[in-house]
């Protein structure tokens, strides 16, 4: 679709006569016929098969014609086609006298015709106008003419159809050649498609509109290439969504039971070893000088009791000095002078001579050391207990009294709070830090799912003669305790009133 | 041969969501070429947009509808939804689903037959 | 909001031509499309992109669309053409549809 356009602009007719040679009374007033069809060799009279156009009278005799398309008027003259244009054409402009007011053709003599002529030859499709000039004997026409496309047409022969839009069909403008050129931001064959997010993931992630990056279902982050793991995951990482992957020392579905406590939470103090002994639990292995489960306390040197036989402990800056007891000397009064003659075993221990009665040696009894066996054995001094473990001395022999969740004859081994199924009605049962938490069946409810929740058997009264109604919880039925007198499932019946059965 | 069949309640009462589905059968939901639209048709009267959904759950409303209407896509069951809440009897209509297609530059070239809706108490 | 405006009503007799207009503001610059609609049926698209005929529609319909007039042709119309004919538009992400033309053919 397109306009052949065609703008008179001089018309020269100085002696003012008709092609016949007879002048016009009292002037020539000249209009034009236009007659625009296909191209033909030789142009000759036919149907006007691409159009026609008439104007009004624009002068007398001689003239210019008046550009008048800025006012809309008619010059250039619009001859529009519906069709392909061809790149061809024949061109018939005719140059009529109009006697008077009415110029239709059955209204005018024959003879009335100042000038014909007639041209043909190729025209491209182009904003630019061609200029002609046409004489005959007695007249002269100056004329341009172009072809352009209708609005919303491009293309060399204006047969491509093209509107810009934008909208969700497609954000476009027309090229010159009827093809797309996507408004930035949009791709796709009708720029229809959004150009996201530089670097959004061609798979976990979208967009509806250009520089946007929606995540699809369990990704995440402003690439949507961060998966989303389970929910309620603590310490675990996923490569595909809902995943629960444990980082290194964590356990359980949602990683969150600690598996190396010594890593995680460094509880040894003052330079102690740390050794992970079980979930959330741990022992301290103390350097000389400090003790406490941590190792958080500062032991004196005479803490260690280092003066044997007696020998009292002094501290000093640069470690320790024992006193010793009269018969005794050495660094740690280990030297006696005393012998088996002088009763140093105390505690019914019995003397040994030795290196010929110039030494003696103790054998204590059960409960006693020392080399006088002065001292009474504590088997707690090398803190046994892990775990914050509490060490007794029970006679003979020593025991571990145990923080809650830890067990074992040091305290070594952690407790599973779940380890003796304390979720009632068959509730699952998870291990946290501090405690348990039970995930109850429907129909259940309460720390340890030992509340049930559905109807109450009993809610609807079933038992006669104030008989104490109980659920059992297990079937979800009711039982009657009756009351003296009374027997029956719902103690409806009188003792010594036997109901009555048909058979 | 594609194929779009509207599904739903016949009567919903006033001041209630309408909820219908459209399932397509003989394509895919998720065909970039393609937005799929719900049209309504009031007895004796004429043809009304109400709103179309993309693959990616982009949507768009008629504004006279707007804040009452939403559509929905599920692209795992080939389908996509419709809801229109606090209805009253002006809703009374066919409500068609169809296809709208971007080389036709939005024509819908496939409908399907249509369900009543009719709102009354 | 953009509205497209239709005649109600277009008589025809057999074998000859109806013209059906539907008008909206500069609807030139958008793309026209043509529903035909039988009673008791879901719209048909006959027309699309202002002329083109989706394939089955006979060649007997036909489209244009200029300034703020889009016309659809049926020329030598048939009986079973008796219908609602309904064009719609795009007017930015709305689709708008014109109020609809009962053709009778006599």
């Known amino acids: 679709s397109g306009v052949f356009q065609l703008q008179l602009q001089e018309f020269i007719n100085e002696r003012g006569v008709l092609a016949s040679g007879r002048p016009c009374e009292p002037g020539c007033r000249t209009f034009f016929r236009v007659c625009l069809k296909h191209f033909q060799a030789v142009v000759s009279p036919g149907p006007c098969t691409f159009g026609t156009v008439s104007t009004p009278v624009l002068g007398t005799n001689s003239f210019a014609v008046r550009d008048d398309s800025s006012g809309g008027g008619r010059n250039p003259l619009q001859l529009p086609f519906n069709f392909t244009w061809p790149g061809t054409f024949s061109l018939i402009i005719e140059a009529w006298h109009a006697p008077g007011d009415d110029l239709r053709p059955e209204a005018l003599p024959p003879d009335a015709l100042i000038s014909k002529i007639a041209i043909q030859g190729s025209l491209a499709v182009g904003q630019n106008w061609l200029l002609d000039e046409q004489t005959s004997t007695l007249t002269r026409l100056r004329y341009s003419y172009r072809v352009i496309c209708s609005d919303n047409y491009y293309g060399d022969n204006c047969s491509r159809l093209c509107k810009k839009r934008n909208d969700h069909f497609g954000h476009y403008v027309c090229q010159p050649d009827g093809n797309l050129s996507c408004l930035p931001g949009w791709t796709g064959e009708y720029c229809q498609q959004p150009i996201c997010l530089s670097g959004c993931h061609e798979q976990n992630g979208y967009c509806s509109k250009p520089a946007e990056c929606l995540c699809r279902p369990g990704w995440q982050g402003r690439l949507c290439n961060e998966c989303i793991p389970h929910n309620g995951c603590r310490h675990g990482t996923c490569s595909t969504p809902w995943q629960c992957t444990c980082d290194e020392g964590w356990g359980g579905l949602f990683c969150d039971q600690d598996l190396n406590y010594c890593t995680h939470h460094s509880p040894c103090k003052n330079g102690a070893t740390c050794s992970n002994s079980g979930q959330r639990s741990y022992t301290c292995t103390c350097r000389p000088g400090y003790t406490g489960v941590d190792c958080e306390l500062e032991l004196s040197e005479c803490d260690s009791n280092p003066c044997r036989n007696g020998g009292s402990c002094k501290d000093q800056e640069d470690g320790y000095h024992c006193l010793c007891p009269p018969g005794y000397y050495g660094l740690h009064c280990e030297h006696s002078t005393l012998s088996c003659a002088d009763s140093p075993c105390f505690n019914g221990g019995s003397c040994r001579e030795r290196n010929q009665g110039a030494n003696y040696a103790c054998e204590c009894p059960p409960n006693f050391t020392g080399s006088n066996c002065e001292k009474k054995v504590d088997r707690c001094t090398s803190n046994p207990c892990a775990n914050g473990g509490q060490c007794l001395n029970r006679g003979p022999s020593r025991m571990c009294r145990c923080r809650p969740g830890f067990t074992g004859t040091y305290c070594e081994l952690h407790v599973s709070d779940c380890a003796r199924n304390p979720c009632a009605h068959g509730g699952t049962c998870h291990d946290l830090e501090n405690g348990l938490m039970c995930t109850c069946p429907a129909g259940f409810s309460g720390r340890r799912c030992e509340v049930r929740t559905s109807i109450d058997a009993c809610a609807s009264s079933p038992c006669f003669n104030r008989a104490t109604c109980y659920t059992d919880l297990s079937t979800d039925t009711f039982v009657c305790n009756c009351p003296y007198g009374f027997v029956g499932s719902r103690c409806e019946f009188p003792v010594g009133l036997p109901p009555s059965f048909p058979w | 041969e594609v194929q779009l069949q509207e599904s739903g309640p016949g009567l919903v009462k006033p001041s209630e969501t309408l909820s219908l589905t459209c399932t397509v059968s003989g394509g895919s939901i998720s065909n970039s070429r393609y937005h799929w639209g719900w049209i309504r048709q009031p007895p004796g009267k004429g043809l009304e947009w109400i709103g179309d959904?993309?693959?990616?759950?982009?949507?768009y409303y008629n504004p006279s509808l707007k804040g009452r209407v939403t559509i929905s896509v599920d692209t795992s069951k080939n389908q996509f939804s419709l809801k229109l809440s606090s209805v009253t009897a002006a809703d009374t209509a066919v409500y068609y689903c169809?296809?709208?297609?971007?080389?036709?530059?939005?024509?819908?070239?496939?409908w399907g037959q249509g369900t009543l809706v009719t709102v009354s108490s | 909001s953009y509205e497209l405006t239709q005649p109600p009503s277009v008589s025809v007799s057999p074998g000859q031509t109806a013209s059906i207009t539907c008008s909206g503001q500069r609807l030139g610059d958008k793309y026209a499309s043509w529903y035909q609609q039988k009673p008791g049926q879901s719209p048909v698209l006959v027309i699309y992109?202002?002329?083109k005929r989706p394939s089955g529609i006979p060649e007997r319909f036909s489209g244009s669309n200029s300034g703020d007039t889009a016309t659809l042709t049926i020329s030598g119309t048939q009986p079973m053409d008796e219908a609602d004919y309904y064009c719609q538009a795009w007017d930015r992400d709305t689709g708008v549809f014109g109020y609809g033309t009962k053709v009778t053919v006599l």
């Open positions: 169809a296809r709208e297609d971007v080389i036709l530059r939005g024509g819908s070239d496939y």
């Open positions: 992109e202002d002329s």
């Open positions: 959904i993309y693959y990616t759950g982009s949507t």
